[in-house]
């Protein structure tokens, strides 16, 4: 990646160790709603209730990000180009990749209340 700001982080599975169920991959975004002020930080966490832990890769606007596998993606000092839709892909050895829902990251300019629409990055 560019500078790797993904942080490896261990969490216990959300289903019993022996479970073979294909559980949904959950993508959690902080701040909630994905709207952040310029220069702020966005943290994306991919929660996969599977054992053993799968490899997690990240996508932005449907394109793989050049990052080592990690369940957490941290984007500090958010700027215009960070806006877009993000998803994570969990790859298990036992079955094919599972992609999470996509979450949208947007920049709130000062004085705005919520996610912005229209031209990305201002004009």
């Amino acid at each position: 990646m560019g500078s790797s700001h993904h942080h490896h982080h261990h969490s216990s599975g959300l289903v019993p160790r022996g479970s073979h169920m294909l559980e949904e991959v959950q993508l959690v975004v902080e701040p909630e709603g994905g709207a952040v002020a310029p220069g702020g930080t966005v943290t994306l966490t991919c929660e996969v209730p599977a054992q053993p832990s799968p490899q997690i890769h990240w996508m932005k606007d449907g394109v793989p990000l050049p990052l080592p596998p990690s369940p957490v993606l941290i984007l500090p000092e958010i700027g215009p180009q960070d806006q877009g839709t993000y998803s994570c892909v969990a790859t298990h050895s036992s079955h094919g990749p599972q992609e999470s829902r996509a979450v949208s990251i947007s920049i709130i300019e000062p004085g705005e209340e919520g996610p912005t629409a229209g031209s990305v990055g201002g004009s």
Epitope: G2, S3, S4, H5, G62, E77, Q81, D82
Partner: antibody
Amino acid sequence: QIQLVQSGPELKKPGETVKISCKASGYTFTNFGMNWVKQAPGKGLKWMGYINTNTGESIYSEEFKGRFAFSLETSASTAYLQINNLKNEDTATYFCARSRMVTAYGMDYWGQGTSVTVSS
Amino acid sequence: DIVMTQSQKFMSTSVGDRVSITCKASQNVGTAVAWYQQRPGQSPKLLIFSASNRYTGVPDRFTGSGSGTDFTLTLSNMQPEDLADYFCQQYSSYPLTFGVGTKLELK
């Protein structure tokens, strides 16, 4: 404000070595990687490669493997480009330009460029 | 390597004109394309990213469009300060590659 400030012009002889610096300010240096771009006189832009400012890992375009080396002095928020065994065809302006990742992002801030002239 | 072809190296224009600069990728790059402006003696400046998004502070007379292999930078109401070289660049995969550039000149 965000700035990338490069070292001054260099006049070198063939076979010598040059080391260009790019000092970043206005942001956290390790949050964004650094690209190096060559522009020969009157020509277009050529991507030389990218250095990950967290790990120091470099990616070089095929044409720039061998005599070219990227390095960092993270404590000084500075990236370096070293060119060994200079050749006449290295005469160019070299730019540093930041991007969050090597792909998926454009280069949003550029240094002012460093002119390197190689002549005997 | 992905080749970015800017077929028009020079374009003659007048103040107030609408100008379209085209760029063709040798393979599908999605929307991972940026456009840069380089005025004489200056460093390049990011105008457009993700093929169609204007970067902060860029006047709205600059518009990017396209996806896949065909991309266009359109400049409506050309101003004297817009006389410059314009480069497209793909950042879908490395090596990153630029077009050769299109120079806007006054008629």
